[in-house]
């Protein structure tokens, strides 16, 4: 969308935006819309909040449609009530080491963050706090019913997840990628988030990319087994096109998407890579993204809580991501 | 009530400017975009400008955008037209609308000031 | 975009029905999918009043006798029953791209 046409903007009066969102007018100044937060997609229709120093970095000048919302060089970070500056390391709590880097928080885990899948040793892990200890440990319960562990047994798959090393040194550099950022969004189009110093001038930038945990049209519930509790993986249909403000993926995508459960764990992404799609835009623009691709996710009990300032903002973390 | 009164109309020789007012009332101001239309002697009716709530766009005719430029004071609830190098063909009644930026354009109008462009 | 109006004179007796027409040059469709077609009204010695917006979207306090039509580049303004105080000039309107214009009018008068 250019700016050139007539100013015409949503029937409904202007938005009421959440507190600390500002009010301001889109990027062809035309219609009062709700600031784009840090992180978030940003258009030209959709702008990033000028109060808080943000602005859309659409990546190469090729993809100047929809970018992500960034702070200035040098920006600080409000984390936890805290003002980091640009570059500075700090532990959130015993669990994570984390950089700021212009606006952006990454963190790296301290804890194994393993998602443990049941296993013939072990076929009810669960993670626990154990006192005096700041990191939660597996422990295996012994089943409540010991006839479901046996012929069960061949369908419990044993699941390693690879995250990145961070000790990796090359070339007078100490190589440090944070986690991906879980996705923004539970559903539909989200970004997803890392900082990483793996370049050749050895500089800490921020990376992102597009991520869909789920479709939000799929009513997944509806597709769990009669005596299941959850639906991992589900199927797709059929071959779908992604979309992405107004724009559709050039290729159709056979992608994997994550389940749901109704006995109040959450499904996640478990392993994932990152692969580059092309959408095209009503004015025939092509755009490449990168965007996070499945590859297994996890269901689980340990799902966002409001005890850990990290694991409510950022869980949940994608691990082994085959880039 | 609703109210749009214009003001700043009046006689001008040909090169002459000058700069029209139109003060609103009965509304919050701030939360509309304003226009300019005219209307020559026994003609029809041809936009002229508009402006965005807070001033920071605006589009207009593009055979009048070096010689017409239109303005808004949210303090003082008032849309300005300045006119400067005026023509015989400049001439006609400038109403001033509230345009509403959403479903219709001109759903209040003034009652119009003439301009006449005469030597 | 020109609006071109048909006919610019329309007699008509009180109660009758009237019909005016609007083409325009080329598709009035707006980026955003809306049609922005307007219809307005100038009674002698006023100023102009709108009677519909977006095709056929009646203002507030437009009898309900006005009806609007059409789409892409052809519309039409309905008057059912024709009163003597919908005598005027009546004149279509696209905001869907610049230069805003407004068609050369039809003026409504008793025959």
């Known amino acids: 969308q250019n700016c050139s046409g007539p100013c015409r903007c949503p029937d409904e009066p202007a938005p009421r935006c959440p507190a600390g969102v500002s009010l301001v007018l889109d990027g062809c100044g035309c219609c009062r819309v709700c600031a784009k937060q840090l992180g978030e997609l940003c258009t030209e229709r959709d702008p990033c909040d000028p109060h808080k120093g943000l602005f859309c970095d659409f990546g190469s000048p090729a993809n100047r449609k929809i970018g992500v919302c960034t702070a200035k060089d040098g920006a600080p970070c409000i984390f936890g009530g805290t003002v980091y500056r640009s570059g500075e390391s700090f532990q959130s709590s015993c669990k994570y080491q984390c950089t700021c880097l212009d606006g952006a928080v990454g963190c790296m885990p301290l804890c194994s963050m393993d998602v443990r899948l049941p296993s013939p040793d072990c076929p009810f892990p669960r993670r626990v706090k154990l006192p005096g200890k700041c990191c939660e440990e597996w422990v295996c319960d012994e089943p409540k019913d010991q006839t479901v562990v046996g012929p069960a047994l061949a369908a419990y798959r044993l699941e390693d997840t690879f995250g990145p090393d961070p000790t990796m040194i090359r070339a007078n550099c100490l190589v440090q990628t944070t986690e991906w950022s879980a996705c923004s969004k539970t559903c539909g189009m989200g970004i997803s988030t890392r900082v990483t110093n793996d370049n050749a001038s050895c500089r800490l930038e921020k990376q992102s990319r597009l991520c869909m945990v789920r479709p939000c049209e799929a009513d997944l519930e509806e597709n769990i087994k009669k005596g299941k509790k959850c639906i991992r993986t589900p199927k797709i249909s059929k071959p779908i096109k992604f979309e992405l403000s107004g724009c559709t993926s050039m290729k159709t995508y056979r992608a994997k998407f994550c389940g749901v459960c109704t006995d109040g764990r959450c499904c996640t992404p478990h392993r994932t890579t990152t692969l580059p799609v092309e959408f095209k835009c009503p004015d025939g623009e092509v755009m490449k993204k990168n965007m996070m691709f499945i590859k297994t996710c996890a269901c689980h009990y340990n799902c966002p809580g409001d005890n850990d300032i990290f694991e409510s903002l950022y869980y949940r973390k994608m691990y082994g991501d085959m880039a | 009530e609703v109210q749009l009164v214009e003001s700043g109309g009046g006689l001008v020789q040909p090169g002459g400017s000058l700069r029209l007012s139109c003060a609103a009332s009965?509304?919050?101001?701030?939360?509309?975009?304003m226009a300019w239309v005219r209307q020559a002697p026994g003609k029809g009716l041809e936009w002229v400008a508009n402006i965005n709530y807070e001033g920071s766009r605006t589009d207009l005719l593009d055979s009048l955008k070096s010689r017409f430029t239109i303005s808004r004071d949210n303090a003082k609830n008032s849309v300005y037209l300045q006119m400067n190098s005026l023509r015989a063909e400049d001439t006609a009644v400038y109403y001033c609308a509230r345009d509403t930026s959403r479903g219709s354009y001109f759903d209040v109008w003034g009652a119009g000031t003439t301009v006449t462009v005469s030597s | 975009v020109v609006m071109t109006q048909t006919p610019l004179s329309l007699p008509v007796s009180l109660g009758d029905q009237a019909s005016i027409s609007c083409r325009s040059s080329q598709s009035i469709v707006h980026y955003n999918g809306n049609t922005y077609l307007e219809w307005y009204l100038q009674k002698p010695g006023q100023s102009p009043q709108l009677l519909i917006y977006?095709?056929?979207n009646r203002d507030s306090g437009v009898p309900d006798r006005f009806s609007g039509s059409g789409s892409g580049t052809d519309f039409t303004l309905k008057i059912s029953r024709v009163e003597a105080e919908d005598l005027g000039v009546y004149y279509c309107?696209?905001?869907?791209?610049?230069?805003?214009?407004f068609g050369q009018g039809t003026k409504l008068e008793i025959k």
């Open positions: 309107f696209q905001g869907s791209h610049f230069p805003l214009t």
């Open positions: 009965g509304f919050t101001f701030s939360d509309y975009y």
């Open positions: 977006k095709v056929s």
